[in-house]
Amino acid sequence: TTELTEEKYEYKEGQTLEVKCDYALEKYANSRKAWQKMEGKMPKILAKTERPSENSHPVQVGRITLEDYPDHGLLQVQMTNLQVEDSGLYQCVIYQHPKESHVLFNPICLVVTKGSSGTPGSSENSTQNVYRTPSTTAKALGPRYTSPRTVTQAPPESTVVVSTPGSEINLTNVTDIIRVPVFN
């Protein structure tokens, strides 16, 4: 059995996380998409798109904005004004049923720390883009994870684009998809 490899992203308070999830397959184009946070072993849906999705029709829930591009197979997630308590494990999912989601991407381990001054300054409002491509090494999330890969945040005034390496995945096998129960 294979494991989901989490990737660690470090931010300062006040910064913005931008994630682009690449779902590619047409069968997901009209499905609802969601951004979820793992709380213990259980995922919590923080925001989800409407159905059917429409291009450039953002859904905003507090500091989270979801924008689906079904004609291009992309979901854009933005979390603004990050706080220390936002730290945790997040995932893009295809939200198909009330109690089931299809997890197509390795989880993001978000670590938010206080800035040097302790409060976010205007120079810290940078965005780090995270590009997600489907995972072929996936199993239902359990209490243990493989060692995270740390992506060090660049100086606050810069914008960093972090791309998931490797070729796109040919999702021809439904075992490439993890089904995780959703409790909202």
Partner: antibody, heavy 121, light 111 residues
């Protein structure tokens, strides 16, 4: 291993019709859009059109040069895509390739070897 | 329609030297910061082969001397050290908008 095999090419007179087939194997055919691309001898590549999947209602899109004359269809039960060419013109003479993308608006990762269509009197 | 214009039309480069091919789009091929611009290599009598997808991603099995860059309307394919087997015609292609379109091709030869 993904394989795409075109067939049905040949010699046809101007104004005539021809139907090309693309037999696919090695992947879940119904999951992916299928495209046709052509290439006249010594010339560049020209995208002909595409057909999407059932979840996209088998929507089709065409290049302006073939719209109204060519029709793309698919039979998921036979893992086959088709290109019906009507009102053929001499300028339609080309090698016709069947291609498969990697998902919505993604790149053409897989190509057939092509089949030659010659329109001549 | 999006028109892709490649330059130069033909290129002669010495073995081991760098080869650069440009592709300019008549309008942006980007959506959500993704560039839907791809590069293919075609040798005589063969179907095209994917080299680079979405502007800068190297297709699996393609030598890392090939690289792609650019966004919006301007893109570049670079071969860092030309090898004899790289002699071919190279095409850029956009899939951001229907109809999909190809550049006219660039013929790469050995000097």
């Amino acid at each position: 291993e993904v394989q795409l095999v075109e067939s049905g090419g040949g010699l046809v007179q101007p104004g005539g019709s021809l139907k090309l087939s693309c037999a696919a194997s090695g992947f879940t055919f119904s999951t992916y859009a299928m495209h046709w691309v052509r290439q006249a001898s010594g010339k560049g590549l020209e995208w002909v059109g595409r057909i999407r999947t059932k979840s996209s209602n088998y929507a089709t899109y065409y290049a302006a040069s073939v719209k109204g004359r060519f029709t793309i269809s698919r039979d998921d039960s036979k893992n086959t895509a088709y290109l019906q060419m009507n009102s053929l013109k001499t300028e339609d003479t080309a090698v016709y390739y069947c291609t498969r993308d990697m998902g919505i608006r993604r790149q053409f990762a897989y190509w057939g070897q092509g089949t030659l269509v010659t329109v001549s009197s | 329609d999006i028109v892709l214009t490649q330059s130069p039309d033909s290129l002669a480069v010495s073995l081991g030297e760098r080869a650069t091919i440009n592709c300019r789009a008549s309008q942006s091929v980007d959506t959500a910061d993704y560039s839907f611009l791809h590069w293919y290599q075609q040798k005589p009598g063969q179907p095209p082969k994917l080299l680079i997808y979405r502007a800068s991603n190297l297709e699996s099995g393609v030598p890392d001397r090939f690289s792609g860059s650019g966004s919006g309307t301007d893109f570049t394919l670079t071969i860092s050290s030309l090898q004899a087997e790289d002699v071919a015609v190279y095409y850029c292609q956009q899939s951001n908008q229907d109809p999909y379109t190809f550049g006219q091709g660039t013929k790469l030869e050995i000097k």
